[in-house]
Interface confidence: medium
Amino acid sequence: EAHKSEIAHRFKDLGEQHFKGLVLIAFSQYLQKCPYEEHIKLVQEVTDFAKTCVADENAENCDKSIHTLFGDKLCAIPKLRDNYGELADCCAKQEPERNECFLQHKDDNPNLPPFQRPEAEAMCTSFQENPTSFLGHYLHEVARRHPYFYAPELLYYAEKYNEVLTQCCTESDKAACLTPKLDAVKEKALVAAVRQRMKCSSMQRFGERAFKAWAVARMSQRFPNAEFAEITKLATDVTKINKECCHGDLLECADDRAELAKYMCENQATISSKLQACCDKPVLQKSQCLAEIEHDNIPADLPSIAADFVEDKEVCKNYAEAKDVFLGTFLYEYSRRHPDYSVSLLLRLAKKYEATLEKCCAEGDPPACYGTVLAEFQPLVEEPKNLVKTNCELYEKLGEYGFQNAVLVRYTQKAPQVSTPTLVEAARNLGRVGTKCCTLPEAQRLPCVEDYLSAILNRLCVLHEKTPVSEKVTKCCSGSLVERRPCFSALTVDETYVPKEFKAETFTFHSDICTLPDKEKQIKKQTALAELVKHKPKATEDQLKTVMGDFAQFVDKCCKAADKDNCFATEGPNLVARSKEALA
């Protein structure tokens, strides 16, 4: 129904706390360089204005759209052009073009320092002094670094952060309590960020139809007892919600997400037997719980898929007269039978089925032509199964760090033109797939591995799009979203690449490496490894092992030395010489 004042409507639906959090996220995602203090001032102004509209929906400007109100606020910021350059040009446009312009200027890799977690005592002091401000800073810092983070989910992580701090700051050993718990929240949030970025990429590049297909497959896997009409309704709602969040309509997105959770909980009987535990929780936890819900049990009496989609004589009629509904039904039926497949694989199979019908229904004897289609799925299913098998075996053999290094070598050889920091980030994330997925039961491995890899590769594509340097990467990133992972997997050593000059300074290290945390130390070593591969793209595994082993010993030795600086200064050049020789 239409509301006189959109902002009043959202304020009443969401409540002040969530309203303020979402407005802060929206501003932080649009203007990523502004300090917290500047954003919080705007948030307060918007909140005060919303309250006047709640009191009187006919008050001045209350009838304006939220995009108009937010855009006007952002465009009134002094020195906007000084800080944001051409983003200020957006302010000359009218809505909806102005908002589109803001969206285009979102930076997936903003030039911001990594988010440093304060020391435990300091963190607890500032949290206890002002929890609202502390959590506001958290929202701001995460949102500006991840401009497509799913806003209602970020509110959930802030709530989790709050819970951890409330619990741990009363403990005697605060750090021991905080570190593992906050690490777990951070890990989940980072995965959520790349997953959501993938959803927004899907929406931006391929539109709502492609996203809805993804949603149908996912929902059918989770809720195999729900009917197609129910799955379609859920997929339509989820598509709308994600479109809103990806488009910067965060208040509407969060409000609609809460509505969907309410609907699901009121209709458990027709959706899934597993929802009850989620439905007893408060709104943010309820939505999150539903989003992570385990699969319902597959109905025992499902007939063979062939009866409906291969053996039936009406296949071509259905395809011709109701393409989307027929293909949607196929995707639903196949997905509900295969929770052990990745969504990407299910979409590839649906695409193969569509291409087969497209070809066969134009021929003289369609049933004879499409009769073998299910058998033709086999190679498409085997490819990702083999990928999981070989990569999990490698992970089990090498451990996470070693596996990351193997992936780094592989991807540097595939796309040596890509910047080293981007390659290292991608390889570290791709390498985490082992820890995340390879320890799961067999039936859960494939969906975990492939859908996670797809999200990480989407991040690589998004960064590469900003400064395209590799034709091969551009080719894989330009194609369909579901073909990306197989495309990257199929890439081999780039034969067109002219090896990088050997620069001694790239492999020169100082004593500051000794005091770095383990993660930073690993990144330094992995940076060196990527540079080595760029220098010698065809170096053998043994050569790289020798050089990296030598390097690790050198760092270890010098960090234990009494005069560290002197050790690095004298041993460093020897290491460089030995490395050059080993790679010759």
């Epitope: 009917e227 197609f228 009409a229 039936d312 004589k313 009406e314």
Partner: nanobody
Framework: EVQLLESGGGLVQPGGSLRLSCAAS????????VAWFRQAPGKGREFVAG????????YYADSVKGRFTISRDNSKNTLYLQMNSLRPEDTAVYYC???????????????????WGQGTLVTVSS
């Protein structure tokens, strides 16, 4: 739970007409594929006609094409089968069946339809 109730059967002369009705309760008839099947004495249940749910696509067995018309009235939650130019070989018990969650008639195999009415007898004889 879905309930289906057929009516409109009877005795009719060859060349005559009849209109069968199938009233549904427990679900909206426009949401799902619904079909008419028939069963002659000593034979299996065979597909006669069907209509898609949410998409008005109609399906007919070759033996009834051009003579029978399937339709539905969503406001009454009722499915119809208009039968013209009836022949003695059309004599059978006519059933309506539904496959919940199916927007299209993707099968004419009776075993795949979990919900049935009790049937209405149509006799074509002079």
């Amino acid at each position: 739970e879905v309930q289906l109730l057929e009516s409109g059967g009877g005795l009719v002369q060859p060349g005559g007409s009849l209109r069968l009705s199938c009233a549904a309760s427990g679900r909206y008839i426009d949401e799902t594929a619904v079909a008419w099947f028939r069963q002659a004495p000593g034979k299996g249940r065979e597909f006669v006609a069907g209509i898609g749910g949410g998409v008005d696509i109609t399906y007919y067995a070759d033996s009834v094409k051009g003579r029978f018309t399937i339709s539905r009235d969503n406001s009454k939650n009722t499915l119809y089968l208009q039968m013209n130019s009836l022949r003695p070989e059309d004599t059978a018990v006519y059933y309506c069946g539904t496959r919940p969650g199916r927007p299209l008639i993707t099968s004419k195999v009776a075993d795949l339809y979990p919900y049935w009415g009790q049937g209405t007898l149509v006799t074509v004889s002079s």
